[in-house]
């Protein structure tokens, strides 16, 4: 009964830093309490971008100071992160965990690649 | 450098309380599920107890529901056990141990020892 | 609950030898939810893998992990002294955690 969670190989992000990917997962219960994790992999070592829980049915929510953005749906999760550069572009996973009720069930995708490209800076005019 | 460090572990009798601590440093505690697990002498791994980042979900083994309590404080980055109705059969090593971002169990403490006897 | 269980018991091998220990699941753990821990006596124990087959920070290349579904294995390519210890294995894709019982290494 593991879960299985899914989410795009690669992802290119804007010209302004902004990269969106869904992750969906299957659940193999019924929670009422979800926890969303984006974790950035970098060689080996592994850090949190972003976390939020949300209660089903209703809106994910982010920290106000969060990098991250994200809706939800059924067993789909619409998330955006921004502010990236250049040095940001790398393996980003998510993690899902059902909280409540048990059993809990963790959940980890294969990882998005994000490509992040900074823009070339405006020529000045005379 | 990131370290667990429990305390509280000792002699009690049958029926009685005892209350372990973990002092966790060098990493950012609520970000992180914390688990106590324990080894009975010359035995295996048996997992106990978690609790998860913000304190509100908790989970216990059969063996320990209802008598053990998990807590954190992630103000002063500590995790507790409180242990009541202590059995003979509770007598172990108690590790508190960091659940990793991707899962496993990453980081262990040196283990505090409880013996419950008459 | 799933159910770990290690073999053999006790692998009696010398240094320089392979050691290939195994931990079956009563039913599918996804590869991407099992450990293997290392425990010496007196220590607490030092995760090694995860993810089935990952090595952890610090964790020398004779040591390597596969299997998927209900089969894993840890294998030591060559047997250092400091080797000898108790090898578990651990799922933590679902509750309650667990862990087999345990295969210990020793020196022939």
């Known amino acids: 009964k593991a879960m299985h969670v899914a989410q795009p190989a690669v992802v290119l992000a804007s010209s302004r830093g902004i990269a969106s990917f869904v992750c969906e997962y299957a659940s193999p219960g019924k929670a009422t309490e979800v926890r969303v994790t984006v974790l950035r992999q970098a060689d080996s070592q592994v850090t949190e971008v972003c976390a939020a829980t949300y209660m089903m049915g209703n809106e994910l929510t982010f920290l106000d100071d969060s990098i991250c953005t994200g809706t939800s749906s059924g067993n789909q999760v619409n998330l955006t992160i921004q502010g990236l550069r250049a040095m940001d572009t790398g393996l980003y996973i998510c993690k899902v965990e059902l909280m409540y009720p048990p059993p809990y069930y963790l959940g980890i995708g294969n990882g998005t690649q994000i490509y992040v490209i900074d823009p070339e800076p405006c020529p000045d005019s005379d | 450098q990131v370290q667990l460090v429990e305390s509280g572990g000792g002699v009690v009798q049958p029926g009685r309380s005892l209350r372990l601590s973990c002092a966790a440093s060098g990493f950012t505690f609520s970000s992180f599920g914390m688990h106590w697990v324990r080894q009975a002498p010359g035995k295996g791994l048996e997992w106990v107890a978690v609790i998860w980042y913000d304190g509100n979900n908790k989970y216990y083994a059969d063996s320990v529901k209802g008598r053990f309590t998990i807590s954190r404080d992630n103000s002063k980055n500590t995790l507790s056990l409180q242990m009541n109705s202590l059995r003979a059969e509770d007598t172990a090593l108690y590790y508190c141990?960091?659940?990793?971002?991707?899962?496993?169990?990453?980081?262990w403490g040196q283990g505090t020892m409880v013996t419950v006897s008459s | 609950e799933i159910v770990l269980t290690q073999s053999p018991g006790t692998l009696s091998l010398s240094p320089g030898e392979r050691a290939t220990l195994s931990c079956r699941a009563s039913?599918?753990?996804?590869?991407?939810?099992l450990a293997w821990y290392q425990q010496k006596p007196g220590q607490a124990p030092r995760l090694l893998i995860y993810g089935a087959s990952s090595r952890a920070t610090g964790i020398p290349d004779r040591f390597s992990g596969s299997g998927s579904g209900t089969d894993f294995t840890l294998t030591i390519s060559r047997l250092e002294p400091e080797d000898f210890a108790v090898y578990y294995c651990q799922q933590y894709g679902s509750s309650p955690w667990t862990f087999g019982q345990g295969t210990k290494v020793e020196i022939k």
């Open positions: 039913q599918s753990v996804s590869s991407s939810y």
């Open positions: 141990a960091r659940g990793a971002l991707l899962g496993a169990f990453d980081i």
